[in-house]
């Protein structure tokens, strides 16, 4: 069994390449079923992952992917050179960066090669569908007896990013939220400092160079101030 | 974009329509072919791409097909086992380069 | 396949007045949406694709919005020669799917 597993951190297990194998048409044609809809998200500008549910088809099928980008010198059809599988069954191509042209179109085409006229195509904005990697480095510094400031560092164009910071003490029952632009700093202007406070950070690619939807995974948390868990139950939970 | 078509097809008869284009290479754009019954809405037939791989109309697949012929620039959509239901004006129209979608259209040929 | 639905089947309105068409679609489409006119006798025109981009050479009376399913067409300032059918229609993915169309009566 070869499974490919790409996560939004970079973190990649085993890889597979892929072997084009035909199976026997199906004596009941199946030219009208849908085909699968293909979900692409860019990793950062690093990758792209275009995948689709394989387990979908009324049996296991090899569908294939072709893509072409419109208006530009990379318009010429492209087959896929690295599929991903799951379960020996193709359900997904990666392409790496040199393959990747955030600002023209990209039509990626499945296709199941037992039944050639079933295929479907599918148009999308690539700078739409970038997901960058977690913000990295929180540092925290005090800029007043009161005052706060936490840095974080991405590893992409900073003003091509915009971010969320959450924050909470050891006796809040929620995150408070804080939206930041590309400038990658926030101020907590009044601190206590008889509290613990706990620190996160997501970006996505919005607004300048894209308009993603999807932020990035969270950083690793970071931490200020006393640390009074002994005294307050919400501490625990909170780090679990 | 201009369509030629036969006008007039008998019931269980096939359709055949040209569309001959200037101006732009079918090569470099997709043709898709699109049809208005009378005093009803648009439906989409189907779409040569400028790479030459087609996609159809999945209540149409079985009858429909489409190819062309570059040298010539034409393109060709052909229908088998029509039905009164068929009738209809048959547009074909441009796939933009950098316009995502279908920005000159035929004036259509009726198909009755 | 994808649905899109237009509600209204027709929309009445006078010259000067601003009216917005809408289109639903039956799933995420991305903001491939595309808007076009058809006047009695004519061809379809290009409006709107990308739910936003102004095709060439449309007046900037018209202006395209939405997200995720749901989508807008406004015309501002309603003129006499805008009386005609609108169709949306995605082009997210094959096949191709247009609205029922939308008839604006001045």
């Known amino acids: 069994l070869n499974t490919t597993i790409l996560t939004p951190n970079g973190n990649e297990d085993t890889t597979a390449d892929f072997f084009l194998t035909t199976m026997p048409t199906d004596s009941l044609s199946v030219s009208t079923l849908p085909l699968p809809e293909v979900q692409c998200f860019v990793f950062n500008v690093e990758y792209m992952n275009c995948t689709w549910n394989s387990s979908s088809e009324p049996q296991p099928t090899n569908l294939t992917l072709h893509y072409w980008y419109k208006n530009s010198d990379n318009d010429k059809v492209q087959k896929c050179s690295h599929y991903l599988f799951s379960e020996e069954i193709t359900s997904g191509c990666q392409l790496q960066k040199k393959e990747i042209h955030l600002y023209q179109t990209f039509v990626v085409q499945l296709q199941d090669p037992r039944e050639p006229r079933r295929q479907a195509t599918q148009m999308l904005k690539l700078q739409n569908l970038v997901i960058p990697w977690a913000p990295e480095n929180l540092t925290l510094h005090k800029l007043s007896e009161s005052q706060l400031e936490l840095n974080w560092n991405n590893r992409f164009l900073n003003h091509c990013l915009e971010h969320l910071v959450q924050y909470r003490t050891d006796w809040d029952h929620s995150w408070t939220e804080q939206s930041v632009d590309y400038r990658h700093k926030f101020s907590l202007p009044s601190v206590d400092g008889q509290k613990r406070y706990t620190f996160r950070v997501r970006s996505r690619f919005n607004p300048l160079c894209g308009s993603a939807q999807h932020w990035s995974e969270w950083s690793h948390p970071i931490h200020w101030g006393s640390n009074t868990s002994k005294e307050n139950p919400f501490l625990f939970a909170l780090e679990a | 974009l201009q369509e030629s078509g036969p006008g007039l097809v008998a019931p269980s008869q096939s359709l055949s329509i040209t569309c001959t284009v200037s101006?732009?290479?079918?090569?470099?754009?997709?043709v898709h072919w699109v049809r208005q019954p009378p005093g009803k809405g648009l439906e989409w037939l189907g779409v040569i791409w400028a790479g030459g791989s087609t996609n159809y109309n999945s209540a149409l697949m079985s009858r429909l097909n489409i190819n062309r012929d570059n040298s010539k620039s034409q393109i060709f959509l052909k229908m088998n086992s029509l039905q009164t239901d068929d009738t209809a004006i048959y547009y074909c129209a441009r796939e933009g380069s950098t316009v995502d979608s279908m920005d000159y259209w035929g004036q259509g040929t009726t198909v009755t | 396949d994808i649905v899109m639905t237009q509600s209204h089947k027709f929309m009445s309105t006078s010259v000067g007045d601003s009216i917005t068409i809408t289109c639903k679609a039956s799933q995420d489409v991305t903001t491939a949406v595309a808007w076009y006119q058809q006047k009695p006798g004519q061809s379809p025109k290009l409006l709107i694709y990308w739910a936003s981009t102004r095709h060439t050479g449309v007046p900037d009376r018209f202006t395209g919005s939405g997200s995720g399913t749901d989508y807008t067409l406004t015309i501002s300032s309603v003129q006499a020669e805008d009386l005609a059918l609108y169709y949306c229609q995605q082009h997210y993915i094959t096949p191709w799917t247009f609205g029922g169309g939308t008839k604006l009566e001045i």
């Open positions: 101006g732009f290479s079918l090569t470099s754009y997709g």
